[in-house]
């Protein structure tokens, strides 16, 4: 039902859903700190623009009695319960920040008359694609899928002279929320990735993965998985790996690879790591100092959500336009705004664009090196290292299909 919004007469409120079930196990206090830091910046920017208005956030907490798994499995109803709470209290702001779980976002979007914008730090799944009033500030599965298809098709680089059309996907059900939806998208039979590949099999057991590494009859040399190096080591250990196996490790929200003193462990030599380009100023920020890289990205998305609202509020106020309109609700897309750590670009569907980075381990230096970058905004790959010191034969990525088993 239509809920009146606290969003006029120079006073603008942001409703922040503080859900017990979250994409990342982040203390809600840290998210509050991120939101409050964002509010300070927004107030300063509005004041500098000569706009004498009040901007506040209302944190809406779930009672946690029913929906207490802590992860996203029981988030579907928690989001709706919080919306009901907002509705009963007549406390809807101009914008809703949260939820982060794909299940809850999808359900909330489905079950509500959305005449206000929703900003999410998460909602990675394909089911949250193309939603008219939803903005996602962490890379959704669709962006990953487009990179992989682009990379698979690439065959004109000095280090990749074969198009690939096959893959194994390792997915054992213990993944983090981001990985769960990334792999889900690759597994889905109707997805772009599946449509473009000739062969794709999901490996669900550790043993299946381990057997493939030296199986002469394997149908693909390429295995996609999601997680960090430690996750790979637990699975692979020091097992022998056929020399034309390529493991693609998706680890988007982890910038440890870019630290100066990091040495790649030996088990990473057959691995290409896909991550996001690292931020810079965040390292000194008050809200992020004690956070792990993944959690820093999550908290940053909350902060950037506040800055995005401030950006849109400023534009609409300067143009003398009403905030409580469908026009405002649909405006949070196809733009670039000043985020906390640099510019943030949103595509036509309100999803964040980024630079994805594919890293390899140099056999010379045992360091991670950038092989190529990929701009999600233009769906384009840019080679960086034209003569990589790979472990693979002739310093080229092998074909995805082995002619005669491990060479």
């Amino acid at each position: 039902s239509q809920v009146s919004q606290n969003c006029h007469n120079g006073s603008y409120e942001i409703s922040v859903l503080m859900m017990g079930n979250s994409a990342f196990a982040e203390p809600l206090k840290n998210l509050e700190d991120a939101v409050n830091e964002g509010l300070e910046i927004v107030r300063g920017r509005l004041q500098n623009a000569g706009l004498n208005v009040t901007v506040n956030a209302t944190f809406m907490y779930s009672d946690g009695l029913i929906h207490n798994s802590g992860d996203c499995r029981s988030s579907t109803c928690e989001g709706l319960d919080l919306l009901r709470k907002i509705s009963n209290a007549q406390r809807m702001g101009c914008v809703l920040i949260g939820p982060s779980c794909t299940y809850s976002t999808f359900q909330m979007y489905l079950d509500t008359e959305l005449s206000y914008p929703m900003i999410s730090a998460g909602s990675f799944g394909l089911s949250c694609d193309y939603k008219e009033t939803l903005t996602r500030l962490m890379s959704p599965a669709r962006k990953l899928m487009y990179f992989l298809v682009n990379f698979w098709k690439t065959n004109d680089l000095p280090f990749k002279t074969y198009s690939w059309s096959t893959s194994y996907v390792y997915k054992n059900g213990t993944e983090t929320e981001d990985c769960f939806w990334y792999l889900n998208a690759l597994e889905a039979s109707v997805s772009y990735f599946s449509h473009e590949l000739g062969f794709k099999v999901v490996l669900r057991q550790d043993k299946e993965f381990q057997d493939i590494l030296m199986d002469h009859n394997r149908k693909s040399n390429v295995i996609i998985m999601c997680g960090g190096p430690e996750f790979l080591y637990k699975l692979k250990g020091d097992r022998a790996v056929a020399e034309d196996i390529v493991i693609i490790l998706v680890d988007l929200f982890n910038d440890q690879y870019f630290e100066d003193n990091v040495t790649a462990p030996d088990y990473m030599k057959n691995v290409l790591v896909l991550t996001l380009s690292p931020g810079n100023s965040l390292l000194n920020s008050s809200f992020s100092r004690n956070l792990s890289p993944t959690k820093r990205d999550f908290a940053l998305a909350y902060l950037n959500g506040i800055l995005l609202f401030g950006h849109m509020l400023k534009i609409f106020l300067e143009n003398g336009e009403n905030i409580t309109t469908p026009k405002f609700a649909h405006a949070f897309r196809n733009l670039t705004f000043e985020g906390y750590d640099g510019p943030v670009t949103l595509d036509d569907w309100g999803d964040v664009d980024s630079t994805m980075v594919l890293l390899y381990t140099s056999v010379d230096t045992k360091k991670y090196k950038v092989l190529l970058t990929y701009d999600t905004h233009v769906n384009k790959t840019y080679p960086v290292d034209m003569s990589p010191t790979f472990t693979w034969k002739n310093s080229k990525l092998p074909n995805d299909i082995t002619g005669r088993g491990p060479q």
Epitope: Y257, D260, V262, P278, G342, T355, V370, T373, D375, D385
Partner: nanobody
Amino acid sequence: QVHLVESGGGSVQSGGSLRLSCAGSGYTYSTHCMGWFRQAPGKERERVATIDKDGRTSHYADAVKGRFTISQDNAKNTLYLQMSSLNPEDTAMYYCAAAEHRGAWCPLWDRSAPLLAHIHWGQGTQVTVSS
């Protein structure tokens, strides 16, 4: 304080060549990556070519591949851009840029590089190519 000064721009006929130079001070090549960007009137600043702190990884825009070559002379603290087979689409203001490496990462490779605060820029040198 990082200071970058470009030179070598000018007017040239289509098919001609130019060599741009960028003299730098206030930083060391061993910690910074360097690059050339350009901005045509009414357009956004775009990456042309970059070179990493080791001087071995070059990164070119599609439009200039095979025609432009980036190089550096560490002894002279100078970055170069050799441009050949120039065409009118290459007309722009050319800027030299420097940024501190973060491990393997050069911020000039980021899609948002022209807008990032921690990148140092020169004043630019104009290149005009007439048909």
